[in-house]
């Protein structure tokens, strides 16, 4: 049986829209699936790498590395997503190409990043981890660090950086799917929402769905243990 | 072609309050954002403020806040712009002009406002 | 808020001559300036959005550089029409800011 949950939601375009949480219902009148999972129950994603789901990872990552940030041109705020969902004429979709893009390295000007931009985070103004040295980032969006430390300036001169940041990561089902949503539509969908990320590519979904004891490499699922504590 | 038809002048007594009226044509209303600016006589030009036709999200210049109040009717495409508690200060000539690309790159022909009692 | 200075605030310049008008922002804004041509009891008119990018239909004898907070405004050989008022316009934050305005008056 499914439980069905409507509600008028705040999405990323800032608009509420009416959106609908289907949950599977227990059978035997008990938990949810998800809360069965955290409990130790026998699901094969958590023991093992599940095909499907890695092809899923792998699909939502390709897509992200070809998103920028849209800023919405009413001051609304901004929020990570492809072009095709950025309006042309309401918002600005920062997205570096060409030579619009900052150097790679502040002391080699000749190499332009074509990967961002991404809203609140930029190698120019995190300052942890620092993007210099050997420890350059990558010109792929999908490789870059949780920035934990901000360069302390309230304007940057970036557009994507001074925006009113709308949407952030948000792990979706038992599948470990990930979206770039507002906070209340990922607490109405029983998501987990990641405060402290800018990308689906920085957290680790399945991770956090299966629970338990935390995977030694946050890609490969490791919890064999399962067999025995169902 | 694009239009922004704006509502004729206005003498008005202090105290009171005025609405100003700006018609689209030529183009899809909710697809722009519309801006209001301030223009005194003889002096420069002041931001008002934005409205978002499409899901009604207005931002205001904070010196503007209490003073203008904007909203748009999708079925008539048109934007309008309320001024209350008007005094002398308020006398201006006011602009509604269509965003794009953050700049304004089409303007009504401006409504005057004249507040004297 | 971000305030913009232009100057100057006017300038006698004769047919066929060139002109610069400058805008400093108080604070960086990128390339995010827009340049308009007022006439006498007129509406602005766009010239110049995202600070070099001539708007639709505008002569290209109107130009624009610079980013930061250091722009510049530039009509080289000017024609009886362009002696008008100009205005700068930071459109990177709100509330968007205009510069004071430069009037070109004819030598």
């Known amino acids: 049986a499914q439980h069905v949950t409507t509600q008028l939601v705040l999405r990323n375009k800032g608009v509420y829209e009416s959106v609908k949480y289907i949950q599977q219902e227990n059978f035997w009148i008990g938990p949810s699936s998800i809360d069965l999972i955290h409990l130790g129950a026998k699901f094969s994603p958590c023991i093992r790498k599940d095909q499907q789901i890695e092809q899923l990872v792998l699909r939502e990552r390709d897509l992200e590395r070809d998103s920028g940030c849209c800023v919405q041109n009413d001051h609304s705020g901004c929020i990570q997503t492809q072009r095709k969902d950025c309006s042309e004429t309401l918002a600005t979709f920062v997205k570096w190409q060409d030579d619009t893009g900052p150097p790679m390295d502040k002391s080699d000007l000749g190499q332009k990043r074509t990967s961002g931009a991404v809203c609140h985070q930029d190698p120019r103004t995190c300052e942890e981890p620092a993007s210099s040295g050997a420890h350059i980032w990558p010109d792929d969006i999908t490789k870059w660090p949780i920035c934990t430390e901000q360069a302390k300036s309230n304007r940057t001169g970036f557009l994507h950086m001074d925006c009113q940041i709308k949407g952030r990561p948000c792990c979706i089902s038992t599948k470990g799917s990930c979206e770039i949503t507002t906070r209340e539509y990922c607490e109405f969908m029983h998501g987990y929402f990641h405060e402290e990320a800018t990308l689906c590519s920085q957290v680790h979904c399945l991770d956090k769905v299966c629970g338990l004891l935390p995977f030694l490499n946050p890609e490969v699922p490791d919890q064999f243990y399962r067999l025995w504590l169902s | 072609q694009v239009q922004l038809q704006q509502s004729g002048a206005e003498l008005v007594r202090p105290g009171t309050s005025v609405k100003v009226s700006c018609k689209a044509s030529?183009?899809?209303?909710?697809?722009?954002?519309i801006e209001w600016v301030k223009q005194r006589p003889g002096q420069g030009l002041e931001w008002i403020g934005v409205?978002?036709?499409?899901?009604?999200?207005?931002n205001y210049n904070e010196k503007f806040k209490g003073k203008a109040i904007l909203n748009a009717d999708k079925s008539s495409s048109t934007a309008y712009m309320q001024l209350i508690s008007l005094t002398s200060e308020d006398s201006a000539v006011y602009f509604c002009?269509?965003?794009?690309?953050?700049?304004?790159?089409?303007w009504g022909q401006g409504t005057s406002v004249t507040v004297s009692s | 808020d971000i305030q913009m200075t232009q100057s100057p605030a006017s300038q006698s310049a004769s047919l066929g001559e060139s002109v610069t008008i400058t805008c400093l922002a108080s604070?960086?804004?990128?390339?995010?300036l827009a340049w308009y041509q007022q006439k006498p009891g007129k509406s602005p008119q766009l010239l110049i959005h995202?600070?070099?990018s001539l708007a639709d239909g505008v002569p290209s004898r109107f130009s624009g550089s610079g980013s930061g907070t250091k722009f510049s405004f530039k009509i080289s050989s000017l024609q009886a029409e362009d002696f008008v008022s100009y205005y700068c316009?930071?459109?990177?934050?709100?509330?968007?800011?205009f510069g004071g305005g430069t009037k070109l008056e004819i030598k």
């Open positions: 030529g183009y899809a209303f909710t697809n722009y954002l």
């Open positions: 316009q930071q459109i990177y934050s709100s509330p968007y800011t």
């Open positions: 002009a269509r965003d794009l690309k953050r700049a304004m790159d089409h």
């Open positions: 409205i978002n036709p499409g899901s009604g999200f207005t």
């Open positions: 604070q960086t804004i990128g390339t995010w």
């Open positions: 995202a600070a070099t």
